[in-house]
């Protein structure tokens, strides 16, 4: 969100979407001329806008929704200009006379229009005059025009639901990034902040909201009293891509907070009647309490409503006053949400209630530095949701969320630097690939770092002045750092190895982090950029030669020792990190710091050693830990792939999530490459004798799975026991699923299952039974009430073993009236996670890219995840020539953002052949042994 | 090329409510800005009421604002004036206008386009 994030899947962050837009076109224009040039020019900035809106919900006599609209741009001149650039995409204005009406403000003298024209590629409406505009002088631009009101998910679109059997119909907006254009004419760039004065003219039954509160009362429109006029509060001055507005007949529940600040949680009437947004409500007021404390400022504006739409493409949107979700990120139903929803639903709000400040307050220059406002939120996250849900230990779960999730990627060489230089980013396209998982996950890890080894206290001290002294204006990353190095200058406690800036470059300007590497009997550290295909070429040069200022926590023999800052050199030696023979050193506590750590074999030994004597002694994230980065590191040649399975011998005593969740998600990995082989029967026995005394433990616990436990890693790891034991084949979990699913089914008004379990429960079910099970689970889809429970549905039906049926949910998924088209994509992905429906779902995505492409275009990041969902597999000669086939085969289509998850998916692929290859006979062997 | 027809003229007692209409003819009417005129015997053509191409301009000469509304139908290809609490000063030819422009106008020399006119009397 754009997070925003699109957590279809149970705690599987991803980015958000936004519109893309593939054209090389551009190169061919005269560049001279500033109407062919994507950047607006200087010359005018806009001061206020006076925007009034008319959405028609229902369609005209071409059967096409619409809506009118009428601006008035206030603009000033900066330089002499004799054209006035202003955004403008899909909108028409009258083709009688101009297309515009200027006129001078005050004194100032206005030329005549010559001519005004509509620059498609480039999304302008360029006015061409006869004379010049004189720089100090005002005027304004009047325009009315009128869009389609369509179902497309950006810019002013409506989005539809049915209520029993009438279909409703409701007008919003997504503007990010560059959707504001298409709903009026706008200079429509982040430091092209100004005020916004919005009127809402809409039938007078329906409710009109947008980002302020509005001036008094609706009043009926003079000409025809069914419609009604919301005139809105003017807002600060701000920035384009956070305009919100909408029309529906949605209904809220409200507090006022102590400060006086209306907080306002909007969905469907049913939702609202069933107090569906009661959590919402409950946990907004103290976090937004908390970020106004963490960045010593008040909430800027006079109301904070959230709403919950049934269309929507990203996970959230952090709209000014108006934030938008979908229905899954805001909306939650003890009766039927399961304990990961109510972590979706306060992380997502956490996240987007901390960019009313960082990133709407005070706002980026320009889109190359988006990595910080979301990664910034997206660490802050985790602050505002543990604030809010303090017994959780939620800020434990950026480890797994997002440090390791994005090491992934970061460890490719075809990953990026976090900073992009401006000048590369400049098509819609351009700036739709920055909403990655680099700049929200990796710029969520790094800006964590930073905050650890500042200390909390002294960061926040640098981001409350950083705040006040840009509110209402624009930055770029370079100004934060400023403001933090005054708050380290200003104190003597917390000493730094080089300046705030120099060690912050080294993260930023460069792509991957290193492995530590520590040799325990000489104490000897060293550094290394990780790849995990140690034979990859990185064709990116660095300006630091892949060196990093490394900030070093560690733990010998559960003793907390003294920080170390490893500079950027290769190598260096601290007695720190020497042992005696007996003892262990661990590095990087809680990982706080964005690298990996790799010791010599009989460190290795001894952490294993201690882990299954007295586990306790490493802290828990320590434990998962040792498992992610050894993992990590045999993929990358470093340690043999025995040592990492050695790793998780110590599961068996492990009660914990972390350890097992950095376990499965590693391991995942070996089931995707050999879930079509023999390897996979020893592998699946390991993991249940491994599993079943978690899943004994959880049994008893809950007395026999009808309770629940207390706090919510225990509930996360009860979820993974029943989740690993049953598909691993435990008698006793399958017997579980299908008797609680079989009561279910005789009795379809009462569902036995506890939400927690659902997603496991259900997906074991479809996948031990048959078309009886399908269906019936389909039928209970098409009535869910709450997008919950429909998202664990549709997820779980891709568990089929039956190709068929597999083969007909893909052909649903290209129907918007079964699969909304926002969850198009991870349905399309859902059935590709299932080793029978992979196959299936990559013919299907090959036969059908054009027309996803086209019909799909709106959700640019949908895209990457897609080409990502159903190549994972790929591990054969044979599947690469596929996909560079698909490659050709759709180059006149285009890739949109998904183009870079295609060269991902190609280097994944090789590493993927290569790594098989080498591993299959030893990993048999293991798991054999082991069995 | 734009043919604009008025009707809904008539005679009404003053306090009363007339409705007219303007049909016009020519595909571009939904760009245009539409305005009606009125012309008193012995006295000059004076502006009434003018709408933008979208509809969400409307001006109103101040004697007939909260009395008259102006409003159009593009499917129809119609403008319309609603005239209530109508006063014996109100008694006129109504005229028409199209203008080769979107933006609503009070001037009389900015449309290029004139109806016939429908006659509207106002008995006290």
């Known amino acids: 969100y754009a997070q925003e994030k699109n957590k279809n899947a149970e705690h599987v962050p991803q980015a958000p979407t936004s519109p893309t837009i593939t054209t090389t076109a551009a190169i061919t224009l005269d560049q001279s001329k500033p109407w062919n040039r994507y950047r607006l020019p200087t010359t005018l900035l806009p001061d206020s806008y006076n925007v009034t809106l008319r959405p028609y919900l229902t369609p005209n006599a071409d059967g096409l929704y619409i809506f009118k609209g009428k601006s008035i741009v206030r603009l000033l001149c900066q330089e002499p200009t004799d054209v006035i650039i202003i955004h403008s995409k899909k909108l028409n204005y009258t083709t009688q006379g101009h297309m515009v009406v200027l006129r001078g403000v005050g004194d100032s003298q206005v030329p005549e229009i010559d001519r005004t024209e509509l620059v498609e590629l480039t999304e302008y409406l360029v006015v061409h005059l006869k004379g010049s505009l004189q720089p100090g002088h005002m005027y304004e631009m009047e325009s009315e025009f009128q869009g389609e009101l369509a179902d497309d998910l950006a810019g002013f679109y409506r989005s539809e639901y049915m209520e029993g059997n009438v279909k409703k119909v409701l007008a919003t907006t997504q503007m990010q990034s560059t959707d504001a254009r298409k709903s009026f004419p706008c200079f429509d760039e982040p430091a092209m902040k100004a005020t916004f004065n919005i009127t809402l003219i809409h039938p007078n039954n329906l409710t009109a909201l947008s980002n302020m509160p509005p001036k008094g009362s609706s009043t009926p429109l003079a000409e025809d009293p069914n419609w009604s006029v919301t005139e809105f509060e003017t807002t600060p001055v701000m920035s384009t891509y956070l305009l919100a507005y909408i029309v529906s007949e949605f209904q809220s529940v409200n507090e006022t907070a102590q400060n006086g600040v209306l907080i306002r949680i909007w969905a469907r009437p049913n939702a609202i009647a069933e107090g569906h947004g009661m959590y919402a409500l409950n946990v907004t007021g103290p976090i937004l309490n908390f970020f106004a404390n963490h960045y010593n400022t008040s909430y800027p504006l006079p109301k904070s409503d959230q709403i919950a739409l049934p269309d929507f493409n990203a996970g959230a949107m952090e709209n000014w006053g108006l934030v938008t979700y979908r229905e899954n990120a805001l909306l939650f139903d003890p009766q039927s949400s399961s304990i990961s929803n109510k972590e979706r639903v306060v992380t997502v709000i956490a996240h987007e209630l901390a960019h009313q400040w960082f990133g709407n307050l005070v706002t980026l220059a320009w889109w190359n530095d988006l990595w910080l406002n979301e990664g910034f939120a997206s660490y802050v996250e985790y602050l505002g949701a543990d604030h809010a849900e303090p017994t959780w230990n939620l800020k434990d779960l950026i480890v797994p969320g997002d440090v390791y999730r994005v090491m992934a990627v970061d460890a490719l060489a075809s990953s990026h630097p976090l900073t992009t230089p401006a000048e590369e980013v400049n098509t819609p396209a351009q700036i739709s690939e920055m909403f990655d998982s680099i700049s929200y996950s990796k710029g969520a890890s790094v800006i964590r770092m930073l905050s650890n080894f500042l200390t909390e206290d002294l960061f926040k001290e640098g981001l409350a002045s950083y705040l006040h002294a840009f509110a209402y204006q624009n930055t770029t990353y370079l100004d934060l750092w400023e403001h933090l190095q005054k708050a380290v200058d200003a104190q003597t406690s917390i000493r730094l190895p080089d300046t705030v800036r120099a060690i912050m470059d080294r993260w930023t300007l460069q792509m991957g982090f290193p492995v530590i590497t520590v040799d325990t009997k000489t104490g000897n550290i060293s550094q290394k950029h990780f790849l995990l295909d140690s034979e990859s070429n990185v064709t990116r040069s660095s300006a630091f030669d892949y060196l990093w200022i490394v900030p070093i926590s560690s733990i010998k023999n559960g003793v907390m020792q003294d920080h170390y800052w490893l500079r950027d050199v290769s190598q260096a030696q601290n007695d720190l990190f020497k042992t005696a023979s007996d003892d262990w050193v661990l590095l990087n506590v809680n990982v706080t710091g964005y690298f990996q750590v790799n010791y010599d074999e009989d460190n290795w030994r001894m952490i294993q050693h201690q882990l299954q004597t007295n586990l306790s002694v490493i802290p828990v994230i320590n434990r998962a830990q040792v498992i992610y980065d050894s993992f990590n590191l045999a993929t990358a040649h470093m340690v043999p792939v025995t040592l990492a399975l050695d790793n998780t011998l110590f599961l068996n005593g492990e009660k914990e999530y972390m350890p097992w969740q950095a376990a499965l998600s590693s391991l995942s990995y070996f089931s995707l490459m050999f879930d079509r082989s023999e390897v996979y029967g020893p592998m699946k026995k390991y993991l249940r004798k491994q599993v079943e005394p978690l899943f004994q433990h959880f049994e008893t616990l809950t007395k026999n799975w009808t309770e629940r436990p207390e706090n919510l890693m225990d509930q996360y790891s009860e979820i993974n026991a029943i989740s690993t034991a049953c598909s691993n084949g435990l008698p006793q979990c399958e017997n579980l699923a299908k008797t609680l699913f079989d009561q279910w089914m005789s009795d379809p008004e009462n569902n036995p299952i506890h939400p927690n379990l659902r997603s496991t429960i259900y997906c074991n079910a479809i996948a031990q039974g048959g078309q009886d099970q399908w269906d019936f689970a389909w039928g209970q889809l098409q009535q869910a009430q709450l997008v919950n429970e429909a998202d664990k549905l549709r997820s779980a039906l891709a568990c089929s073993n039956e190709v068929w049926l597999l083969n007909r949910y893909l052909g649903y998924t290209l129907n918007p009236d079964l699969i909304r088209k926002q969850d198009a994509t991870s349905t399309i992905n859902s059935i590709a996670s299932n080793v029978i429906g992979q196959p299936l779902a990559w013919d299907f995505v090959q036969s059908n890219w054009k027309k996803l492409f086209q019909d799909y275009g709106g959700g640019s990041f949908s895209f990457s995840n897609l080409i990502q969902g159903v190549t994972r597999r790929f591990s054969s000669e044979f599947e690469l020539q596929q996909l560079e086939q698909f490659k050709k085969n759709n180059m006149d289509v285009g890739f949109g953002s998904g183009t870079r998850a295609l060269e991902q998916a190609l280097e994944k692929t090789k590493a993927n052949i290569k790594w098989v290859k080498e591993n299959k006979e030893v990993v048999l062997n293991w798991f054999i042994e082991h069995s | 090329q734009v043919q604009l027809q008025e009707s809904g003229g008539g005679l009404v007692q003053a306090g009363g409510s007339l409705r007219l209409s303007c049909a016009a003819s020519?595909?571009?009417?939904?760009?245009?800005?539409m305005g009606w005129f009125r012309q008193a015997p012995g006295k000059e053509r004076e502006f009434v009421a003018a709408i933008s191409w979208t509809g969400l301009t409307t001006n109103y000469a101040d004697s007939v604002k909260g009395r008259f509304f102006i409003s159009r139908d593009d499917a129809k290809n119609t403008v319309y004036l609603q005239m209530n609490s109508l006063k014996p000063e109100d008694t006129a030819v109504y005229y028409c206008?199209?203008?080769?422009?979107?933006?609503?106008?009070?001037?009389?020399?900015?449309?290029?386009?004139w109806g016939q006119g429908t006659q509207v009397t106002v008995s006290s």
């Open positions: 020519g595909r571009t009417f939904s760009s245009n800005a």
């Open positions: 206008a199209a203008r080769q422009s979107g933006y609503a106008s009070k001037f009389l020399d900015e449309y290029g386009y």
